[in-house]
Interface confidence: low
Amino acid sequence: EEELQVIQPEKSVSVAAGDSATLNCTVSSLIPVGPIQWFRGAGPGRELIYNLKEGHFPRVTPVSDPTKRNNMDFSIRISNITPADAGTYYCVKFRKGSPDVELKSGAGTELSVRAKPSAPVVSGPAVRATAEHTVSFTCESHGFSPRDITLKWFKNGNELSDVQTNVDPAGKSVSYSIRSTARVVLTRRDVHSQVICEVAHVTLQGDPLRGTANLSEAIRVPPFLEVTQQSMRADNQVNVTCQVTKFYPQRLQLTWLENGNVSRTEMASALPENKDGTYNWTSWLLVNVSAHRDDVKLTCQVEHDGQPAVNKSFSVKVSAHPKEQGSNTAAENTGTNERNIY
């Protein structure tokens, strides 16, 4: 009798996740009598994929009717392929018996699954940083196959170069993950800036996936402080102004101190945004000069976003009154922790 051949014509098949895969198998002879079974993998740990006689294989259907007389086509179709289905599939002929005896195996067809990467997820630093500091953003995407993938970082459309990227695992796997870290140097103008992680993969047909992060969630822009005195009014009241400018985020508390004693505390809220995303705030204090014998030391103390307070002080010269003082006199910068931390 002619020697039985089990023919698996394709050495490999590549399928997109979610599609169906057809694994072809024909036999050269109807003799000897016995079933065909499909396995994934070889050796004792192989996994039964399809057995016409028994079992429930909801995703596997025969391509032609295997119950037909003289059928020699034992090709199967596996629906809704996932990366977990990747592997080498063997069509195996058994000789009928008790039990059936394995007679011959096909050469095997390697099924590789093209799986899209998941949407890139970008995460930023846990705490805010100020301008000139470097912060790290991480981008992750999972579940793609094959392993070849390209990841790029952009800040406001410009590609970033300080990037470290890893694809895992290093060896063969049904699917892969990519993790990339980009280091970004912040500037005061970055409140409206955005970083984008762009992932390109063969399954995306030229339309890369993007994940974004707003630098507004990673940056702190400390305020500039300026204290000025306006002209004295006819009622012996001096209007002293504290201008707090160019800060972000909006969380800010301002305290006025007269000769070291708290006079008033205010919280910033519902401020209009500058074009660059920062905020300005002006607070003023009316000082009744006639109520004081000595010069009055006024301090504008600002706590921004939970950071240590920054002070600006100004002395109102009582001796110079009741005549008018020169208007818009800039304040001296005195006291502790009063460096302009920009």
Epitope: G18, K116, S118, A119, V121, E140, H142, G143, L209, G211
Partner: antibody, heavy 123, light 107 residues
Framework: QIQLVQSGSELKKPGASVKVSCRAR????????MNWVRQAPGQGLEWMGF????????TYAQGFKGRFVFSLDTSVSTAYLQIGSLKAEDTAVYYC????????????????WGQGTLVTVSS | DIQMTQSPSSLSASVGDRVTITCRAS??????LAWYQQKPGKSPKALIF???YRYIGVPSRFSGSGSGTDFTLTISNLQPEDFATYYC?????????FGQGTKLEIK
């Protein structure tokens, strides 16, 4: 600033229908899938399904097929949940929640949530 | 469906304490797990995604760990604003499912 802004509370009679809206602000609606989550009074969170905002294709969880319809109006950046033939057991807060990408069909973490819409069904 | 079981259902702690909430999945969900915080009358807030990564703006006292079926959310140095209900959620397989919640109360 990214926000999902939902319509206000509704009081309905059994058998009536209700339509809850969820407006996306600060990002492009069609870039992210929109999920719907139910929270009955004093209970936990229950995922109802999502709508692929790019194709408009809805996916419903098992208990939410039939009377529940997800839809979109991309011209006003809004997703909708419509519930028909209301029952007392539909009384709950309904949340819309954004998933990080419509191309990730195995769902994802919900990074932004609407403020919730209380639907009360009572005769 | 994948069942997500949180423990404990509730716990009492004091400001400054370190607390751990666990979440167990009935099947392997890889690292497709998120944690949310919900305060009474408010919508849930995303804390952690992919089992371990904090969203931007989430304080570093919140940390996640685990993979497969066993996950934990740890809050170190509890603050007054941390008293809330916490939910885990798997997003590995449809339907997406949440844990029943853990109510963290002030002692």
């Amino acid at each position: 600033q990214i926000q999902l802004v939902q319509s206000g509370s509704e009081l309905k009679k059994p058998g009536a229908s209700v339509k809850v809206s969820c407006r996306a602000r600060g990002y492009t609606l069609t870039d992210y899938a929109m999920n719907w989550v139910r929270q009955a009074p004093g209970q936990g969170l229950e995922w109802m399904g999502f709508i692929n905002t790019y194709t408009g294709e809805p996916t419903y969880a098992q208990g939410f097929k039939g009377r529940f319809v997800f839809s979109l109006d991309t011209s006003v950046s809004t997703a909708y949940l419509q519930i028909g033939s209301l029952k007392a057991e539909d009384t709950a807060v309904y949340y819309c929640a954004r998933t990080r990408g419509y191309y990730d069909f195995d769902g994802g973490a919900f990074d932004y949530w609407g403020q919730g819409t209380l639907v009360t069904v009572s005769s | 469906d994948i069942q997500m079981t949180q423990s404990p259902s509730s716990l009492s702690a004091s400001v400054g304490d370190r607390v751990t909430i666990t979440c167990r999945a009935s099947q392997n969900v890889g690292t497709h797990l998120a944690w949310y915080q919900q305060k009474p009358g408010k919508s849930p807030k995303a804390l952690i995604f992919s089992a371990i990564y904090r969203y931007i703006g989430v304080p570093s006292r919140f940390s996640g760990s685990g993979s497969g079926t066993d996950f934990t959310l740890t809050i170190s140095n509890l603050q007054p604003e941390d008293f809330a209900t916490y939910y885990c959620q798997q997003y590995n397989t449809y339907p997406l499912t949440f844990g029943q919640g853990t109510k963290l109360e002030i002692k």
